[in-house]
Amino acid sequence: AGSDSLYVPCAPSPCVNGGTCRQTGDFTFECNCLPGFEGSTCERNIDDCPNHRCQNGGVCVDGVNTYNCRCPPQWTGQFCTEDVDECLLQPNACQNGGTCANRNGGYGCVCVNGWSGDDCSENIDDCAFASCTPGSTCIDRVASFSCMCPEGKAGLLCHLDDACISNPCHKGALCDTNPLNGQYICTCPQGYKGADCTEDVDEGNSHHHHHH
């Protein structure tokens, strides 16, 4: 019986996690637990996740008398309520001169003329809307296109007849076609002038350009 009297229920305290021990009888005790803990010795952390309010796809992680949330990349904060500004985090989120616009749960790119796609990395196929004359070949460029004309055709859209086909330039002159109006341009060799390079010139003059 003497050894029994040495037992003091609260010395040392059996209460853990900051619980306070109160002796309720000769051999009994009661633990008053701090918020977030339960059990006869406050040994259990109460699971706060069943009533969680993790937002925007966050996954609940139990804490002590609270909960935390594991957030998807577009959201941050203890409960995933804060939008991540992707435009600050990724200065090069938008390519080819596109402007980054932050949005709740993501971002968008405002692309400059000629580019498209989520990150402005896709060159818009201007040939899809081009009006190159049938038989010509369209070449896509950035925010523009050009038409490669078949023999006998000229102009920006290959819609004009090539005036050089009839060999209007004489005496070995070079013939070029004006892309705007389809007319020929003769670049005369030394000693010749005129629209068709058929006229002689003085010795002092060299290459002449004539349009027709």
Epitope: D48, N51, H52, Q55, N56, G57, V59, P72, F79, T81
Partner: antibody
Framework: EVQLVESGGGLVQPGGSLKLSCAVS????????MEWVRQASGKGLEWVAA??????????VYSASVKDRFTISRDDSKSTAYLQMNSLKTEDTAVYYC???????????WGQGTLVTVSS | DIQMTQSPSSVSASVGDRVTITCQTS??????LAWYQQKPGKSPKLLIY???RLQDGVPSRFSGSGSGTDYTLTISSLQPEDFATYYC?????????FGGGTKVEIK
């Protein structure tokens, strides 16, 4: 434009059942928590039930006053939330609202409400 | 459950007055608080979320503040269309709970 439209309210006897619907449009339904809130005439707002979003496996929570009597569900293919109400009591008489949880600590879109009257 | 104590339950005010409504929670809700306006026969309308953030389309005369357990809604200069009932609501954990409401009436 975000829209929520409730239907299914009406007069029912105590012990009876009723199923409310909330058809939504203008947003990706599966991304959002959906809440049901009710309001008795001349009284304040009382939360009833919630369905979390797809990221949280559409898990469900109920208020103590309706647990085991009410069932919340959702049909993603129809973008519709439901509240099946069984064993109705006179104290369940209220206007029932469905609302969208904004994901930023607030219910940012509400339906027009549907009146449920439980009376003999 | 988190208890919400909203005060006052009603307030009489004139156009142009500054009106303050408070909401106290029974535990820390980590700024997970929203404020709503409701007019008779209408659905509630979100004014403030996350304790202090103004919902899109809501006039800037409405503002929210607070943290921990104490929160405030302020209407800086009351307008005729502001006469309504205002509710606070905690969104930190389920069950969601609302304050009892504050009716703003014309003096």
């Amino acid at each position: 434009e975000v829209q929520l439209v409730e239907s299914g309210g009406g007069l029912v006897q105590p012990g009876g059942s009723l199923k409310l619907s909330c058809a939504v449009s203008g947003f990706t339904f599966s991304d959002f928590y959906m809440e049901w809130v009710r309001q008795a005439s001349g009284k304040g707002l009382e939360w009833v039930a919630a369905s979390r979003n797809k990221a949280n496996d559409f898990s469900i929570v109920y208020s103590a006053s309706v647990k085991d009597r009410f069932t919340i569900s959702r049909d993603d293919s129809k973008s519709t939330a439901y509240l099946q109400m069984n064993s109705l009591k006179t104290e369940d008489t209220a206007v029932y609202y469905c609302s969208r949880d904004s994901g930023r600590w607030g219910l940012d879109a509400w339906g027009q409400g549907t009146l449920v009257t439980v009376s003999s | 459950d988190i208890q919400m104590t909203q005060s006052p339950s009603s307030v009489s005010a004139s156009v142009g007055d500054r009106v303050t409504i408070t909401c106290q929670t029974s535990e820390d809700i980590y700024s997970g608080l929203a404020w709503y306006q409701q007019k008779p026969g209408k659905s509630p309308k979100l004014l403030i979320y996350g304790a202090s953030r103004l919902q899109d389309g809501v006039p800037s005369r409405f503002s929210g503040s607070g943290s921990g357990t104490d929160y405030t809604l302020t209407i800086s200069s009351l307008q005729p269309e502001d006469f309504a009932t205002y509710y606070c609501q905690q969104g930190f954990k389920y069950p969601l709970t609302f304050g009892g409401g504050t009716k703003v009436e014309i003096k």
